[in-house]
C-alpha cells in the first residue's frame, strides 16, 4: 500500500514510496515539508501560508543557517523550517493510527539538522529503520540554532528561545496534520539526544505544548543539565552586537540593529574558541535557551507539574563526558601523556568556581578517593571522564527523573544507562559509550549500513529500537509489537532502577542506584558548601583582541556577568588541514561513530558532537528560599549559585538515600511544585498565572532573572552553578 498525495494544512504533498523486500512492505517518505514560513532573523516563527498544486516532498531541505566546523564560513539557509516523515506501510491497506515519534537533534544548540550527516549515502537521522522495524511514524525537522535561534537580551526586546519555538511549531504541525499520513495525533512521542534531549525535556515543561505530547525520551540531556539555560543572555548578545557593529548601550536599539544585520554576519560573530582555553570548553557556549517568562515561564525545576501526564524515559551514556574531558584535558586519549593530580585539580576548580577553595578541594577529594589504591593512568583518566559525565549529564538526568516521578500522576518513568563501548578506533580501549554513541543504534545504522558493524552492534540496535518504539506505542518499553531482551522496570524514587543497555542483556541488566555516592555528593554535600563572593570567584577573562569569545566573569552582579554557562557544547571545532591534531569530537549531527567524517578529506574522524555539553547552568530559581522543592537547588551539578544569591541553598534534609529529589524540609513528602494550586495545572504562559513576567528591559549587564512563583524577588538560582 502507499499513500500517494496527502492533503495537509499547507496543501497537497507527495513523497516517495520505497519498496522493502519481496513481501510487499514499503515505506512512504516525505522530505522537506514546510511547517512554518521562512524565518525572519530573531523573530518568532510564523505559520506557512501554504501552496497550490502538489508539493513534491522528495529531498531534504537545507539545514538552518550555522557556522561550518571551521567557523570561518556558514552553510544552511534562513529558509529552513521543514520536516521529514517516514510512514511504514503493509502490503494491503494504508497504515492508520500509528504512534508518532518526533526526533529533535542535538548539536549544542549551535549546529545540526533534521537529517544529520551523510555516510555511505545514508543520513544519520534517517527514520526508515525505526519506522519499519517498530511500525511507527518517524518525523524529523530543522530548528534554528546558534545566535539566530537563541540570542536574547533577557527582556522583551529579544526574548530568545526562537529555536525552541520552531520546535514547538513542528510538534503542533504534526498534531494537526499527522492523521492524514496515518498517524495518531493523540500518541506523539518526542525523542532527542544531547541538546535535543534537553529540548525534548523543555518542550514537555513548556505550557505551550499542553495536550500535544504523550511521551518523551531524553538521551544524554535534560532541561536541568547545567549547559541548557543561559543565565546571562545579555552578555552574549552584546558580544555579538559589538562584533557586527551594533550599539550596545541601549537594549532596544541594539535589538533593532541585530534584527536587520546580515544573518550570516550574526552567525559568524560567535565563535567557540578552539585553543588556549582557560576554562572548560563548555563555559564558552553562549546561545542556548533562556527563562523568558513565557515559553519557559520559570526555572525548569519548577515546571515538572506540566509533565505530570507525559510518560518519560531518560538516560545517559556511561562515558558521555569523555569527549568533553578529552577537549579539556587532551592527555586523556594519549597513551604517552599523563594526567596528574595537578591537572585534575585545576579542571575541578574551574567547574566549581563559585564554591571557591572548599568546593574544589572537597570535589577533588571525593573523586580521587580511588587513586590511592589504583594510581594507574587508566584509573585517573577514567576519573576525569566520570567527573565530566556526572556534572554535565548523569546527575542532572537523575534529578530530572526524580522530579518527573515526584510530579507524575498516571505517567510512567524509566531510566537507562547506555554502555555499549565506542567504536572510535582512535580511542583508548577503556573508553565506554561516548557522547552521541547511542544515536547510531537508535536509528538502526548497523542494519542500514552493515559495513563496519558487527552482529553484537545489530543486537544492541534491535533492542533499542524495540524498547523505544514499544514505549511510543504503549508507554511501557516492554509492551508492544517488538520482543525485548529483558524486562525494563520503571524508575521509582525508592529503587532508582535503571536498565543498562549492552550487547548482552538479561535479568542482571536491571540495576539500581547508579553512582549514588556521587549523586549524593553533588545534591547534598556540594550544595551545602558556602558560596564565595564575586571577587573571590571571578576569573579574569582573557584579554587582548583574540577572536575567542572571552569567558564572562561569574557572578550575577552588574560587574560580574554569569559565566556563559550555557549551551553546550559543540565540541570545539577541529583544526582544519592535516594537522596532527586529535580527532575532533563528534560534532552535532555528525555521524555518530563509527561514522567517519563525510567527504573524502583526510581529516580524522569527527566523532558525533551530539550536542551537548555546556557547563552546568542551573535552573534559576528561588534560590535562597529554603526547602522549596528542588527548586533551584535541584542539584544540577556543579554550577554553584553565583554572586550575591544570598545564603547557600539549604540542602534537602534527611539522610534517606532517595535522592536526587529529596523531600523538602524534613517531611517525607515529595517536593511541591509551585505551579498554581492544582498539582497538575500547567503553568500558563500568560496572564496572572504566576508565571514570571518577561523581565524588564534595560541595559543592565546581567539579564534579569524572572522571579519564580514563590520567590519574593528575582534571586539567583539555588542550583549549583559555575
Amino acid at each position: 500500500a502507499k499513500l500517494g498525495a496527502v492533503y495537509t494544512e499547507g496543501g497537497f504533498v507527495e513523497g516517495v514510496n520505497k519498496k522493502l523486500g519481496l513481501l510487499g512492505d514499503s515505506v512512504d517518505i516525505f522530505k522537506g515539508i514546510p511547517f512554518a514560513a521562512p524565518t525572519k532573523a530573531l523573530e518568532n516563527p510564523q505559520p506557512h501560508p501554504g501552496w497550490q498544486g502538489t508539493l513534491k516532498a522528495k529531498n531534504f531541505k537545507k539545514r538552518c543557517l550555522q557556522a561550518t566546523i571551521t567557523q570561518d564560513s556558514t552553510y544552511g539557509d534562513e529558509d529552513c523550517l521543514y520536516l521529514n516523515i517516514w510512514v511504514p506501510q503493509g502490503r494491503k491497506q494504508v497504515s492508520r493510527d500509528l504512534p508518532v515519534m518526533i526526533w529533535i537533534y542535538g548539536g549544542a544548540f549551535l549546529m545540526g539538522s533534521g537529517h544529520g550527516a551523510n555516510f555511505l549515502n545514508n543520513y544519520l537521522y534517517d527514520g526508515e529503520e525505526i519506522a519499519t522495524r517498530g511500525n511507527v511514524i518517524v518525523v524529523t525537522f530543522n530548528y534554528r540554532v546558534g545566535p539566530l535561534g537563541f540570542l536574547s537580551t533577557g527582556d522583551a526586546n529579544l526574548p530568545g528561545n526562537y529555536g525552541l519555538r520552531d520546535q514547538h511549531m513542528a510538534i503542533a504541525w504534526v498534531k494537526r496534520n499527522i492523521a492524514a499520513f496515518g498517524g495518531d495525533p493523540n500518541n506523539i512521542t518526542l525523542f532527542g539526544e544531547s541538546a535535543g534531549g534537553a529540548s525534548v525535556s523543555l518542550q514537555t515543561l513548556s505550557p505551550y505544548n499542553k495536550g500535544l505530547i504523550r511521551r518523551a525520551i531524553s538521551q544524554s540531556g535534560v532541561a536541568l543539565s547545567p549547559w541548557v539555560i543561559q543565565k546571562n543572555p545579555l552578555f552574549w548578545a552584546k558580544k555579538v552586537a559589538e562584533k557586527v557593529g551594533c550599539p550596545v548601550g541601549d537594549a532596544a536599539r541594539m535589538a533593532q540593529c541585530l534584527k536587520v544585520t546580515d544573518p550570516r554576519a550574526l552567525t559568524l560573530a560567535y565563535k567557540v574558541p578552539l585553543a588556549g582555553l582557560e576554562y572548560p570548553m563548555l563555559h564558552y557556549v553562549g546561545f542556548v535557551p533562556v527563562i523568558d517568562g513565557d515559553f519557559i515561564p520559570a526555572d525548569p525545576i519548577n515546571l515538572y507539574a506540566n509533565a505530570a501526564d507525559i510518560d518519560y524515559i531518560a538516560g545517559t551514556n556511561n562515558m558521555d563526558g569523555h569527549i568533553f574531558a578529552s577537549i579539556d584535558m587532551p592527555a586523556i586519549n594519549k597513551g604517552n601523556k599523563k594526567v596528574t593530580e595537578e591537572d585534575f585539580y585545576k579542571l575541578v576548580s574551574e567547574f566549581t568556581i563559585t564554591k571557591g577553595l572548599r568546593g574544589a578541594k572537597t570535589t577533588f577529594d571525593v573523586y580521587t578517593e580511588s587513586w590511592a589504591q589504583d594510581p594507574s593512568q587508566e584509573n585517573k583518566k577514567k576519573t576525569v571522564v566520570d567527573f565530566e559525565t556526572d556534572v554535565l549529564f548523569l546527575v542532572p538526568t537523575e534529578i530530572a527523573l526524580a522530579q518527573h516521578r515526584a510530579n507524575a500522576k498516571s505517567a510512567k518513568t524509566y531510566a537507562y544507562l547506555f554502555s555499549h563501548p565506542s567504536r572510535m578506533p582512535v580511542y583508548p580501549k577503556w573508553v565506554g559509550a561516548d557522547h552521541a554513541d547511542d544515536i547510531q543504534y537508535v536509528f538502526g545504522k548497523p542494519f542500514a549500513t552493515p559495513t563496519g558493524y558487527r552482529p553484537q552492534d545489530r543486537t544492541v540496535s534491535k533492542a533499542m529500537i524495540a524498547y523505544w518504539t514499544n514505549f511510543a506505542k504503549t508507554g511501557d518499553p516492554n509492551m508492544g509489537d517488538s520482543a525485548v531482551p529483558t524486562h525494563w522496570e520503571p524508575y521509582t524514587t525508592e529503587n532508582s532502577g535503571y536498565l543498562e543497555i549492552t550487547k548482552k542483556m538479561g535479568s542482571s541488566s536491571m540495576k539500581r542506584s547508579l553512582r549514588t555516592n556521587f549523586l549524593r555528593y553533588w545534591t547534598l554535600t556540594y550544595l551545602a558548601l558556602p558560596t564565595v563572593t564575586d571577587q573571590e570567584a571571578t576569573p579574569v577573562p582573557p584579554t587582548g583582541d583574540s577572536e575567542a569569545t572571552p569567558v564572562p566573569p561569574t557572578g550575577d552582579s552588574e560587574t560580574a556577568p554569569v559565566p556563559p554557562t550555557g549551551d553546550s557544547g559543540a565540541p570545539p571545532v577541529p583544526p582544519t588541514g592535516d594537522s596532527g591534531a586529535p580527532p575532533v569530537p563528534p560534532t552535532g549531527d555528525s555521524g555518530a561513530p563509527p561514522v567517519p567524517p563525510t567527504g573524502d578529506s583526510g581529516a580524522p574522524p569527527v566523532p558525533p558532537t551530539g550536542d551537548s555539553g555546556a557547563p552546568p547552568v542551573p535552573p534559576t530559581g528561588d534560590s535562597g528560599a529554603p526547602p522549596v522543592p528542588p527548586t533551584g537547588d535541584s542539584g544540577a551539578p556543579p554550577v554553584p549559585p553565583t554572586g550575591d544569591a544570598g545564603p547557600p541553598p539549604v540542602p534537602p534534609t534527611g539522610d534517606s538515600g532517595a535522592p536526587p529529589v529529596p523531600p523538602t524540609g524534613d517531611s517525607g513528602a515529595p517536593p511541591v511544585t509551585p505551579t498554581g494550586d492544582s498539582e497538575t495545572a500547567p503553568v500558563p504562559p500568560t496572564g496572572d498565572s504566576g508565571a514570571p513576567p518577561v523581565p524588564p528591559t534595560g541595559d543592565s549587564e546581567a539579564a534579569p532573572v524572572p522571579p519564580t512563583d514563590d520567590s519574593k524577588e528575582a534571586q539567583m538560582p539555588a542550583v549549583i552553578r559555575f
Partner: antibody
Framework: QVQLVQSGAEVKKPGASVKVSCKAS????????MHWVRQAPGQGLEWMGV????????SYTQKFQGRVTMTRDTSTSTVYMELSSLRSEDTAVYYC????????????WGQGTLVTVSS | DIQMTQSPSSLSASVGDRVTITCRAS?????MNWYQQKPGKAPKLLIY???SLPSGVPSRFSGSGSGTDFTLTISSLQPEDFATYYC????????FGQGTKLEIK
C-alpha cells in the same frame, strides 16, 4: 472574474448516489485546489474534502471516506463530487469553494446545490 | 480532530455597536479564517490567516489572535452586517466553528 457555477438541485432516494458539478471560469483551473463543503438545513458548515485539479489528487475527511469521490475534467474546467449510499441526513446544500491563495481560506464559492434525500 | 468552540452562538446588537466574536481551538492552530453568511447565500471570506482582509472587505472588520484564541471584531455595525459568522481552522482536515448569529436588537 472568478466564477464557480454549480449544477441544479437534486432529489434522491436513500441508498442512491448523487453527482454534483462545479464549473470554474475566470482563472487557471489547474492552479487552485477545489473544496466541497456542505450545510444541512439550519446547521453549520461541514468540510467534506478537496481535489487538486492539476493532478487529480484528493483528500476526504474521515466521515465521508469510502462514500465520496471527487473528480475533475480539465477540458471543461469542471470538478465533480459524487456521494453514494445516500441517507436522509445527507440532505444539505453542497458548495464547491476555491482556495483564495496558498491553502485553505476558501475565497470563492459556488452558489450551492440543494440535495434532498427522501423516500 | 481539532475542536472549535465559537462564542457566543447568537448575539443582538444595534447599528454602530462594536461587536466581538471569539473562537477557541484545541489544540493550537496555525491560521484562523472567518466567513460571513447571509440566509440563502453562500459564505463569503471575511478574514484569512487570523488578521488579513481580502480585497473588498470593509476595514471595520478585523481579526486577531494566535495559537488557541482568536477574535473577530466589527468596530461599528452596519445594517448589512447582520448575518451568521463562522470561524474555520486550517489543518489536514479543516473544521468550522458552529457559527454566531448576529441579529438586530
Amino acid at each position: 472574474q472568478v466564477q464557480l457555477v454549480q449544477s441544479g438541485a437534486e432529489v434522491k432516494k436513500p441508498g442512491a448516489s448523487v453527482k454534483v458539478s462545479c464549473k470554474a471560469s475566470g482563472y487557471t483551473f489547474t492552479s487552485y485546489n477545489m473544496h466541497w463543503v456542505r450545510q444541512a438545513p439550519g446547521q453549520g458548515l461541514e468540510w467534506m474534502g478537496v481535489i487538486n485539479p492539476g493532478d487529480g489528487a484528493t483528500s476526504y475527511t474521515q466521515k465521508f471516506q469510502g462514500r465520496v469521490t471527487m473528480t475533475r475534467d480539465t477540458s471543461t474546467s469542471t470538478v465533480y463530487m459524487e456521494l453514494s449510499s445516500l441517507r436522509s441526513e445527507d440532505t444539505a446544500v453542497y458548495y464547491c469553494a476555491r482556495d483564495y491563495y496558498g491553502s485553505s481560506p476558501l475565497g470563492y464559492w459556488g452558489q450551492g446545490t440543494l440535495v434532498t434525500v427522501s423516500s | 480532530d481539532i475542536q472549535m468552540t465559537q462564542s457566543p452562538s447568537s448575539l443582538s446588537a444595534s447599528v454602530g455597536d462594536r461587536v466581538t466574536i471569539t473562537c477557541r481551538a484545541s489544540p493550537s492552530i496555525s491560521y484562523m479564517n472567518w466567513y460571513q453568511q447571509k440566509p440563502g447565500k453562500a459564505p463569503k471570506l471575511l478574514i484569512y490567516a487570523a488578521s488579513s482582509l481580502p480585497s473588498g472587505v470593509p476595514s471595520r472588520f478585523s481579526g486577531s489572535g494566535s495559537g488557541t484564541d482568536f477574535t473577530l471584531t466589527i468596530s461599528s455595525l452596519q445594517p448589512e452586517d447582520f448575518a451568521t459568522y463562522y470561524c474555520q481552522q486550517r489543518s489536514s482536515s479543516p473544521t468550522f466553528g458552529q457559527g454566531t448569529k448576529l441579529e438586530i436588537k
